[in-house]
Amino acid sequence: APVLPGEDSKDVAAPHSQPLTSSERIDKHIRYILDGISALRKETCNRSNMCESSKEALAENNLNLPKMAEKDGCFQSGFNEDTCLVKIITGLLEFEVYLEYLQNRFESSEEQARAVQMSTKVLIQFLQKKAKNLDAITTPEPTTNASLLTKLQAQNQWLQDMTTHLILRSFKEFLQSSLRALRQM
């Protein structure tokens, strides 16, 4: 942190650090969630063969997982800061229901699943602060989310395992794209 006027720096700190900028804080937070996803994917891949499965398309049809597209303005070509920020926040809000679904899907990584969910809420908050002048952010309907959750939980075991795998993979890709885009902002 900065040195106080009239104080010798060694009285304040040795050495002294700068408070994190909001961008650094967001960056660290995304890394934290990505590390959590890695741990969850490890458990998923260890307990089933979903990670090598070629039948992903079957399950993917049932899911409407957020994805980055060219029109979202998050890629290097056609980059648009405001449009991209809206897409990142909207996407994270849409992922929340899927993260809720993951909560009972892990045994040894239960804490990590909870941490990923909680940290995503924190990340949304950090980003909303960065985007406080943007009003184009739509929040998913709670009733829609509730019925989607019920539908996902009613699937057979194979589909639930596949859904878990796809959520983690898609969320990882979405966060990686977000991280790259946010570093340009």
Partner: antibody
Framework: YPQLVESGGGLVQPGGSLRLSCEAS???????MSWVRQAPGKGLEWVGS????????YYNTKFIDRFTISRDNSKNTLYLQMNSLRAEDTAVYYC?????????WGQGTLVTVSS | AIYMHQEPSSLSASVGDRVTITCQAS??????LAWYQQKPGKAPKLLIY???DRYPEVPSRFSGSGSHEDYTLTISSLQPEDFATYYC?????????FGQGTKLEIK
Amino acid sequence: YPQLVESGGGLVQPGGSLRLSCEASVLFKHQDMSWVRQAPGKGLEWVGSIDPRGDHKYYNTKFIDRFTISRDNSKNTLYLQMNSLRAEDTAVYYCARDLDFMDEWGQGTLVTVSS
Amino acid sequence: AIYMHQEPSSLSASVGDRVTITCQASYWLNSELAWYQQKPGKAPKLLIYDGDDRYPEVPSRFSGSGSHEDYTLTISSLQPEDFATYYCQQYRYTPYTFGQGTKLEIK
């Protein structure tokens, strides 16, 4: 299991040394981490922090000569090496994720310095 | 180092009361201030960061406000689980420093 678990506390004689450990889940690999202590019945006191790679360390000047923070990312563990301990170092020592504010804490480990 | 003067040091209140705890810094903080709740034998829990941002899943009865050197934590309607010790912390300057704490007790 909890995300941050401190260990290594105990009874030590004045002038002695102790190394505290904080075992972290994999989520903390790329995070700044801090040590914070709390003497019995007293308030919180920041000891210092370390960046993800262990290259940069920041200390409360009060502890800079006696305490050293380090980490071993291959073991997902944060350390606090405490030397020349005094009775006033008796406290619960917490490790925490440091985003400038501390949003994740361990349960703490008690260090008692007494003869 | 920045000195954080927290008041009151202890406070007796009843369930349903509105409670205010203040923290005054010895220097301008740019809202880089957090509030924590701590219960006996437990680690502190983050309530508020950046002066007025409520950490996710913290009940809406907790709110933070303030600017420059003066900051406030308000609990709008005390619940039984809110009886604890509260600390402010500045992170504008290293070393990070905490207030002395406010022990909130049942009247």
